[in-house]
Interface confidence: medium
């Protein structure tokens, strides 16, 4: 017997009635006495409404439940479901037997729309560009769980300090709660879109805030023109400073190091004390200078990863800001040489030289050249590859006829460091060996 | 009327760098970001960055990071995109864009006419 | 980053036919905008917000999602609109759009 039933699931909101379709069809003479309906939770087996013996049986599911009796007999065997919750979501059983027997099941889908953003703001007073503030957009009685988006006004997304939080009440309805932690700037827009990914449903919040800036001007903040240069591996100092006023004290003051692009929080110093290091705990200020004016940071252990520009924010009753650039650099190795093939070489035979060095930062700039110090810019290939901590492994190849004789150079330069290593393979006119036999 | 009046088209040397500007008209120049889109000949769009004209903001797709500058005049309300170490795979149509609309939906809603930057030895 | 991946990437068709484009981004997005593109011309809004039609766009253009894939449908294909369709999202960096759908008369 063929049961029909929806592909697509049946999606219900919350508190409104849902039609569960299933039909059959009846042969001619059919009569209802001979058919047995049963509705069932596919999961758990549970009846949930049957048609036996000629007769509704009624409902076994919450007296929620009933059937189009008369339709019944044109094999409409669907089921209303009254006054939809969240716990009904999933799948039904439709089961037909009259001789023959068939069953399908559908799924029924429960959604609820999302309330629009309420949008609060922690502080919410005094505020100055400098600050750091807590942005909360809360939505509420939805299902199911939302997908939370933060937005500038600009349009760009805020991907950065977010905690989205959604916890069920007893109907399993989410209440949504997601925290933007920002440090502000002269103004800006931020905004919440809520999104009920059954519904496609977007509801959405903005909050817009104007720091005060005090009329007095702003802080003057002063750090390197030039990219502070580190070696991984090391300790790098982000050089930061300010002039303090007269009776200045460091209750007064809100230090804020964050990078420039993410707007990610690397240290703070507020309401009088250090609030330590939001970056991987390697982070320090000089603690003893601050109430002379140096804002610096310590940055230890420095990474490939750790490269970019670093915003120092100063907020006294004025507010001032800069960004210093981090370029992290590793020296390259002592190029080791291979030649190949290595043994019984005549002029005139081709051979590959491999100049291989490693683990350096920036990308190396490779040069070849004879023993006169001619460019030999030929026949080379050269290839680098970042190892998991971004460092890089230089091979680059040059692919040479050999002469009566000839030394081959290869250097390996740090461009940022200005650093230079090389090595060299001599190839004489007799037939030889590489590496030369003791 | 809105406009993005973009420069005329280049012809550059590979290694050479590249400087093409963006004037805006009929709104106000610092109130929208202003997007470089660039199209290579038969090819689709890919993102190269934008400029916020107001605070001077930028960002980048980071594959034009190392090699691409962002700058806006705000007293000519023109906006400028710098590309340098011009390669032969920079042949393409730029365009500039103002990304517009309304928290949160933000979309290009008027764009330059385009220019033409042929990079040939 | 999000990749955007239409589908087909050359489409061709005739006057009055219905037509989908298909735009999958690799993970959820806030909202999706489109572009046509004529050539020799510069990219035109035409879809934005998911679902929005830009001003002066005929109501014969619709969009609908289902989960992560977007999809734009044309009711009745008139000349005007054999062109290249861009989608395009800014849900986090970078920006990227999809790599075009060329409608063609058949």
């Known amino acids: 017997l063929e049961v029909q039933v929806p592909e697509d699931p049946v999606v219900a909101l919350v508190g409104t009635d849902a039609t569960l379709r299933c039909s059959f069809s009846p042969e001619p003479g059919f009569s209802l006495a001979q058919l047995n309906l049963i509705w069932q939770l596919t999961d758990t087996k549970q009846l949930v409404h049957s048609f036996t013996e000629g007769r509704d049986q009624g409902s076994a599911y919450a007296n929620r439940t009933a059937l189009f009796l008369d339709l019944l007999a044109q094999g409409n065997a669907s089921l209303r479901l009254q006054r939809v919750r969240v716990a009904d979501e999933g799948s039904f059983t439709c089961f037909v037997s009259i001789r023959d027997f068939g069953s399908a099941a559908v799924s029924l889908q429960v959604a609820a729309p999302y309330s629009k953003p309420s949008m609060t703001l922690e502080p919410n007073k005094d505020l100055r560009p400098g600050d750091t503030v807590t942005i909360t957009c809360s939505s509420y009685r939805g299902y199911p769980e939302a997908e939370v988006f933060w937005q500038d006004g600009q349009g760009a997304p805020l991907t950065g300090n977010v905690t989205t939080s959604q916890m069920a009440n007893e109907q399993g309805l989410f209440d949504v709660h997601s925290v933007l932690r920002v440090v502000l700037g002269a103004n800006g827009t931020y905004s919440c879109l809520v999104r009920n990914p059954v519904l496609q449903q977007d509801a959405h919040g903005s909050i817009t805030i104007t720091p005060q800036r005090s009329p007095t001007g702003a802080v003057e903040v002063q750090v390197p023109e030039d990219p502070v240069v580190a070696l991984v591996g090391t300790d790098a100092t982000l050089r930061c400073s300010f002039s303090p006023e007269p009776g200045f004290s460091l209750a007064q003051l809100n230090l804020i190091w964050q990078l420039t692009d993410t707007k990610q929080l690397v240290h703070s110093f507020t309401e009088g004390r250090d609030q330590g290091s939001a970056y991987a705990n390697r982070t320090a200020l000089f603690l003893d200078l601050l109430a002379q004016g140096n804002a610096s940071l310590r940055l230890q252990r420095v990474r490939v990863a750790d490269e970019g520009s670093f915003t120092c924010f100063v907020s006294i009753r004025d507010f001032g800001s800069a960004a210093v650039s981090l370029q992290v650099a590793a020296p390259y190795s002592k190029p080791s040489m291979t030649l190949e093939p290595n043994k019984d070489l005549r002029p005139g035979d081709t051979v590959t030289i491999t100049c291989s060095s490693y683990r350096g930062y920036p990308e190396a700039e490779v040069f070849w050249q004879d023993g006169q110090g001619a460019p030999l810019t030929g026949n080379v290939t050269t290839s680098q590859m970042a190892n998991e901590q971004g460092l890089f492994d230089v091979h680059s190849v040059l692919r040479v006829v050999l002469g009566a004789n000839g030394t081959y150079s290869c250097l390996v330069r740090n461009p940022v460091l200005q650093q230079d290593a090389h090595g060299s393979v001599t190839i004489t006119g007799q037939p030889m060996t590489f590496p030369p036999e003791a | 009327e809105v406009q993005l009046v973009q420069s005329g088209a280049e012809v550059k040397k590979p290694g050479s760098s590249v400087k093409v500007s963006c004037k805006a008209s009929?709104?106000?120049?610092?109130?929208?970001?202003i997007h470089w889109v660039r199209q290579a000949p038969g090819q689709g769009l890919e993102w190269i960055g934008y400029?916020?004209?107001?605070?001077?903001?930028?960002d980048y797709n980071q594959k034009f990071k190392d090699r691409t500058t962002l700058t806006a005049d705000r007293s000519t309300s023109t906006a400028y995109m710098e590309l340098s170490s011009l390669r032969s795979e920079d042949t393409a149509v730029y365009y500039c864009?103002?990304?517009?609309?309304?928290?949160?939906?933000?979309?290009?809603?008027?764009w330059g006419q385009g220019t033409t930057v042929t990079v040939s030895s | 980053d999000i990749q955007l991946t239409q589908s087909p990437s050359f489409l061709s068709a005739s006057v009055g036919d219905r037509v989908t484009i298909t735009c999958r981004a690799s993970?959820?997005?806030?909202?999706m905008n489109w572009y046509q593109q004529k050539p020799g011309k510069s990219p035109k809004p035409w879809i934005y917000?998911?679902?929005n039609l830009a001003s002066g766009v005929p109501s014969r253009f619709s969009v609908s999602v289902s989960g992560t894939e977007h999809t734009l449908t044309i009711s009745s294909l008139q000349p005007e609109d054999f062109a290249t369709y861009y989608c395009?999202?800014?849900?986090?960096?970078?920006?990227?759009f999809g790599q075009g759908t060329k409608l063609e008369i058949k």
């Open positions: 864009a103002r990304y517009s609309g309304s928290t949160p939906y933000w979309y290009f809603d008027v």
């Open positions: 009929g709104y106000s120049f610092t109130s929208y970001t």
């Open positions: 400029i916020n004209p107001n605070s001077r903001n930028t």
């Open positions: 993970s959820s997005v806030s909202y």
């Open positions: 917000a998911t679902s």
């Open positions: 395009q999202q800014w849900s986090s960096n970078p920006l990227t």
